[in-house]
């Protein structure tokens, strides 16, 4: 999916009002310096591409974050503010339901959510100096 035509300001507002708090709740008890930055993004569409990938694609050691509160709110925000996003996700959602396993918060998932926090921060940050 090409995130170029999303309403970035509306997505930013959704992040600031709820998603950020849900991410903090998920990471509670974890030091902010515990994980190094291993993923970045270079513009808002790129950030959303990486956020979608980390949030909804199963990875080794972290089978699924998709049922977490922050993930469901992320999905809702993208569905509302990114034209045509919902249609592209129907098949992926059906496949995910079949794969669903019991919820376990592993260290790998914590690391992945830490990376998500970094991506969201980059998505929201203004470029302080244009240089």
């Amino acid at each position: 999916y090409d995130f170029t035509n999303c309403d970035f300001e509306k997505i930013k507002a959704a992040y600031l009002s709820t998603i950020s708090k849900d991410l903090i709740t998920y990471m509670s008890g974890t030091k902010s310096t515990e994980f190094n930055n291993t993923v970045s993004c270079s513009n808002r569409p790129h950030c959303l591409t990486e956020i979608q990938s980390l949030t909804f694609n199963p990875t080794a050691g972290c089978a699924s974050l998709a049922k977490e509160m922050f993930a469901m709110k992320t999905k809702a925000a993208l569905a509302i503010w990114c034209p045509g996003y919902s249609e592209t996700q129907i098949n992926a959602t059906q496949a995910m339901k079949k794969r669903r396993k019991r919820k376990v918060t592993t260290n790998k998932c914590l690391e992945q959510v830490s990376q998500l926090q970094g991506l969201w921060r980059r998505f929201n940050r203004p470029l302080l100096k244009q240089q």
Epitope: T38, V39, N43, E50, R122, L128, K129, Q130
Partner: antibody, heavy 122, light 108 residues
Framework: QMQLVESGGGVVQPGRSLRLSCAAS????????MHWVRQAPGKGLEWVAV????????HYADSVKGRFTITRDNSKNTLNLQMNSLRAEDTAVYYC???????????????WGQGTMVTVSS | SYVLTQPPSVSVAPGQTARITCGGN??????VHWYQQKPGQAPVLVVY???DRPSWIPERFSGSNSGNTATLTISRGEAGDEADYYC???????????FGGGTKLTVL
Amino acid sequence: QMQLVESGGGVVQPGRSLRLSCAASGFTFRTYGMHWVRQAPGKGLEWVAVISYSGSYIHYADSVKGRFTITRDNSKNTLNLQMNSLRAEDTAVYYCTRSPQWEEVYEALDIWGQGTMVTVSS
Amino acid sequence: SYVLTQPPSVSVAPGQTARITCGGNNIGSFSVHWYQQKPGQAPVLVVYDDSDRPSWIPERFSGSNSGNTATLTISRGEAGDEADYYCQVWSSTSRHVVFGGGTKLTVL
């Protein structure tokens, strides 16, 4: 463990070519801008070239423009530097390094390889 | 092209504060990054975006930037701080990374 490992350095005659490679591991390579920086013996750091995270944008130092070519293969997590028409003044340790980028601004060079030595001599 | 000017050398007594400057035309409008390089080793990022510090760098390292001068401050200097220090910016005008000439810090 985030790591950058350079290879391909060696001794080469003036006018000849050499290809440097940099293998990245421990981070999502395709999301970072990648640079080559060199350091001549006893001298300071000199930036050589940068390639954007997607490979769409490339910039070179004036001293190497037209002779060096930077490329990346995101499927293999590798960065390359093709060096043609080498000169004695290209003799240096060549470092591969990464930086986050935002639009067309490259941020701090936060991870560096250990470097590979290139000697141009007849 | 944009030029960054550093003093070739700076000395500090153990336990005292060292300040390394980096001069450039209106450098305050740039994000300045600082690197430490010990002999035979690759550079290491010690301060980024003027004053932020990677998590693995001690709080003794700090930075500031305004006007035509950026400054790296190393408080409570130690023998292990002896190294070359480089400032760096990205110039969007020339689309180049620019390094200062480097400053050799000696802990007396």
